[in-house]
């Protein structure tokens, strides 16, 4: 059985205020069963950015159809970027558990920073 890897190919993503940012994340295995969530930051202070299962995240759309059985692409787009959105974003795999899912593995993170507007 192949060990799950969380791949976030970009270490740094330069974005423009007001535009849409695409954060890439793919997994190498469908196991263990459980959701992939997106966070900004690490530790107890991290911000939940996207959870497919619950909540309403109006600025976030997924690149792929997460409901497809064999989907391994958990990339997201965040629209209407502001300076308050800068930080490092992590896709995190959770293992299905009872009563709560358990964090299993995190991607290496993608730092989102503001780039100069194109002239």
């Amino acid at each position: 059985e192949e060990e799950l890897q969380m791949i976030q190919p970009e270490k740094l993503l330069l974005v423009t205020v007001g535009k849409t940012a695409t954060l890439h994340c793919t997994v190498t295995s469908l196991l263990p069963v459980g959701p992939v969530l997106w966070f900004r930051g690490v530790g107890p202070g991290r911000e939940l950015i996207y959870n497919q299962k619950e909540g309403h995240f109006p600025r976030v759309t997924t690149v792929s159809d997460l409901t497809k059985r064999n989907n391994m692409d958990f990339s997201i787009r965040i629209s209407s970027i502001t300076p308050a959105d800068v930080g490092t974003y992590y896709c995190v795999k959770f293992r299905k558990g009872s009563p709560e899912n358990v964090e299993f593995k995190s991607g290496p993170g993608t730092e989102m920073a503001l780039g100069a507007k194109p002239s």
Partner: antibody, heavy 118, light 108 residues
């Protein structure tokens, strides 16, 4: 969406009070929450914010070191522990749900009146 | 720190007339500006977000416009129930979240 504050009352300067905000009608654990206050006859003043998981907090300078925001996601409840209260803390305190992690306040509670007076 | 200045402080408008409220930011806030309505003795209620998007259930007589530093809330045909204080809020830079000082709309 419903937000109901409780715990307000009359206290003397230097005393403490804890406000609660019971949330229902939405996935509480997915959203950042805030406290906003309004002194009598005045405008709105943001007090504090807590992130969805409860580990990240921010405070207005006027309350830093005296107030502590917290949440219990299993009970769908937001708290504001207010210590060393001053007369200028007298206000209606509203809890407010945040639209997303970096956003405006889309739902407000009815408010709890806190009066600090000797 | 971004300061929001609302004008006028008080606006008296006859029923059926147009009310125009202004909110000016001390530095750009992009389109990240919301408007809240607060009726006497009640909690605030979200009207407009992202400068021009109406919140759920808000009548279409309320509209928002502007970007950068200058924003406008327009009530196209004032109703008696629109008597309230209106606050703008920016969420481009935070913390802290900032509100304007408010505009009180009175019915003539």
């Amino acid at each position: 969406v419903q937000l109901v504050e409780s715990g307000g009352g009359v206290v003397r300067p230097g005393e403490s009070l804890r406000l609660s905000c019971a949330a229902s009608g939405f996935s509480f654990s997915s959203y950042a929450m805030n406290w906003v206050r309004q002194a009598p006859g005045e405008g709105l003043e943001w007090v504090s914010r807590i992130n969805s998981g409860g580990g990240g907090t921010d405070y207005a300078e006027s309350v830093k070191g005296r107030f502590t925001i917290s949440r219990d996601n299993s009970e769908n409840t937001l708290y504001l522990q207010m210590n060393s209260l001053r007369a200028e803390d007298t206000a209606v305190y509203y809890c407010a749900k945040q639209y997303d992690w970096n956003g405006f306040f889309d739902y407000w509670g009815l408010g709890a009146l806190v009066t600090v007076s000797s | 720190e971004t300061v929001l200045t609302q004008s006028p402080a008080t606006l008296s408008v006859s029923p059926g007339e147009r009310a125009t409220l202004s909110c000016r930011a001390s530095q750009t806030v992009g389109s990240k500006l919301a408007w809240h309505q607060q009726k006497p003795g009640q909690a605030p209620r979200l009207l407009i977000y992202d400068a021009s998007r109406r919140a759920t259930g808000i009548p279409d007589r309320f509209s928002g416009s502007g970007s950068g530093t200058d924003f406008t809330l327009t009530i196209s045909s004032l109703q008696t129930e629109d008597s309230a204080v209106y606050y703008c809020q920016q969420y481009y830079y935070w913390p802290p979240y900032r509100f304007g000082g408010g505009t009180k709309v009175e019915i003539k």
